[in-house]
Interface confidence: low
């Protein structure tokens, strides 16, 4: 569609059908800006404002902002993984782009230029009770894209999720689709993550999320972030494509059980 032209490379996601949308709480009552939750999520949440801490697993920064680690951060990838970035003006980020690449994309906004998007900005927000932690950028599975459209009615700002058929960049994904059947999306994410770490010479990837894959390379139902010292990493439940099942997260206070949930 015409409105997808400016988005640059597009993650193809499962369509947000009525069942998926029914799992969404309405967006928070107070938002300066609403953004889609991470990856292939269907729900809306609040964008982070300038100066707020951010990271790969946090809400996305608002329009014109980018999540950036501190300039003197020795391990920028780790900083973003740990949520120690800051939402800063996107123009300030460009000065550090060379320094940051080719780390996994940091949270950004959906209105970036194609150049920005290909330079490493992928949205990665979360919503209350439904934390998206597995970044789906490595497994574009479906032939739909999701675009947030903001109504311009002054008194009643309406937000909706539009589903548009993918009409461009399809060729970019043909080899990846083939790869998915060969390896499975989880195995590919794991390999990509490890390749990133190897490229960055990250010798101690504490805090990096290595996905939990089955023998066929698909996601196991239960995924967990690594523990930090005595603090247990939180766990969440996903379907076989890594798509989180709504609401099932724990921050170490209690275990999360995924055995009763259906995998797609």
């Amino acid at each position: 569609g015409a409105s997808s032209a400016g988005l640059g490379p597009v993650v193809r996601c499962e369509p947000c059908d009525a069942r998926a949308l029914a799992q969404c709480a309405p967006p928070p009552a107070v938002c300066a800006e609403l953004v889609r939750e991470p990856g292939c999520g269907c729900c809306l949440t609040c964008a982070l404002s300038e100066g707020q801490p951010c990271g790969i697993y946090t809400e996305r920064c608002g329009s014109g902002l980018r999540c950036q680690p501190s300039p003197d951060e020795a391990r920028p990838l780790q900083a973003l993984l740990d949520g120690r970035g800051l939402c800063v003006n996107a123009s300030a980020v460009s000065r550090l782009r060379a320094y940051l690449l080719p780390a996994p994309p940091a949270p950004g906004n959906a209105s970036e230029s194609e150049e920005d998007r290909s330079a490493g900005s992928v949205e990665s927000p979360s919503v209350s009770s439904t934390h998206r932690v597995s970044d789906p950028k490595f497994h574009p599975l479906h032939s739909k894209i999701i675009i947030i459209k903001k109504g311009h009615a002054k008194d009643s700002q309406r937000y909706k999720v539009d589903y548009e058929s993918q009409s461009t960049d399809t060729q970019n994904f043909s080899s990846e689709s083939k790869r998915e059947t060969e390896y499975g999306p989880c195995r590919r994410e794991m390999e990509d993550t490890l390749n990133h770490l190897k490229f960055l010479n990250v010798l101690s990837p504490r805090g990096v999320h290595i996905p939990n894959c089955d023998k066929k390379g698909f996601y196991k139902k239960k995924q967990c972030r690594p523990s930090k010292g005595r603090k247990r990493g939180f766990c969440w439940c996903v379907d076989k494509y890594g798509q989180p099942l709504p609401g099932y997260t724990t921050k170490g206070k209690e275990d999360v059980h995924c055995y009763s949930m259906q995998s797609k």
């Epitope: 029914a22 709480a25 009552a29 107070v30 209350s128 009770s129 008194d155 609401g247 997260t249």
Partner: antibody, heavy 120, light 110 residues
Framework: QVQLVQSGAEVKKPGASVKVSCKAS????????ISWVRQAPGQGLEWMGW????????NYAQKLQGRVTMTTDTSTSTAYMELRSLRSDDTAVYYC?????????????WGQGTMVTVSS | QAVLTQPPSVSGAPGQRVTISCTGS?????????VHWYQQLPGTAPKLLIY???NRPSGVPDRFSGSKSGTSAPLAITGLQAEDEADYYC??????????FGGGTKLTVL
């Protein structure tokens, strides 16, 4: 201190309308939502809907759709709830409550309540 | 009729431990939505007691604790005191796009 102060008790006839106000103080009004909850005599709490004090977005309980309207006046930090076509079973104490979405949509501050009696 | 199920009443002697159950379904508590608890003392407005399943706002004694498992989210009160006598309500969100409450539980301190 943070508080919500509601308007006084009302007595209405069936078929009439009532408009209850809820004045916020002690916090930035537009940084939160306001939810309305009612409680019939001797009964439990019933959620009626909420309104964003930031942009006026609303979400009403299905049962009350078409009869209830929630509005805000940011200049006075006041939220309003209007209920039309009143029936006797609308007799209840009406509460406004602050919606703190970062607490998972918990209602962290409540008004003192407004008794609305619908009687012929 | 309330969407979340609570016992109409519970009772306990001072110093005892009591638990108030709150049971939902796969479209609310079981879907992972947070559960909150409110205490309503006689003749007053409700007050937030527990938010996000197990968190206490400042000023709420640690005698009150919440948890969640599956479609159930109990509230536990230890070291029962006379001033705990009140109505208690659980609240969650439902995928039918509405906030839902339990029917309320009257706690009597014997």
């Amino acid at each position: 201190q943070v508080q919500l102060v509601q308007s006084g008790a009302e007595v209405k006839k069936p078929g009439a309308s009532v408009k209850v106000s809820c004045k916020a103080s002690g916090y930035t009004f537009t940084s939160y939502g306001i939810s309305w909850v009612r409680q019939a005599p001797g009964q439990g709490l019933e959620w009626m809907g909420w309104i964003s004090a930031y942009n006026g977005n609303t979400n009403y309980a299905q049962k009350l759709q078409g009869r209830v309207t929630m509005t805000t006046d940011t200049s006075t930090s006041t939220a309003y709830m209007e209920l039309r076509s009143l029936r006797s079973d609308d007799t209840a104490v009406y509460y406004c409550a602050r919606v703190k979405w970062e607490l998972g949509w918990a209602f962290d501050i409540w008004g003192q309540g407004t008794m609305v009696t619908v009687s012929s | 009729q309330a969407v979340l199920t609570q016992p109409p009443s519970v009772s306990g002697a001072p110093g005892q431990r009591v638990t108030i159950s709150c049971t939902g379904s796969s479209s609310n508590i079981g879907a992972g939505y947070d559960v909150h608890w409110y205490q309503q003392l006689p003749g007053t407005a409700p007050k937030l007691l527990i938010y996000g399943n197990s968190n206490r706002p400042s000023g709420v004694p640690d005698r009150f604790s919440g948890s969640k498992s599956g479609t159930s989210a109990p509230l536990a009160i230890t070291g029962l005191q006379a001033e705990d006598e009140a109505d208690y309500y659980c609240q969650s969100y439902d995928s039918s796009l509405s906030t839902v409450f339990g029917g309320g539980t009257k706690l009597t301190v014997l």
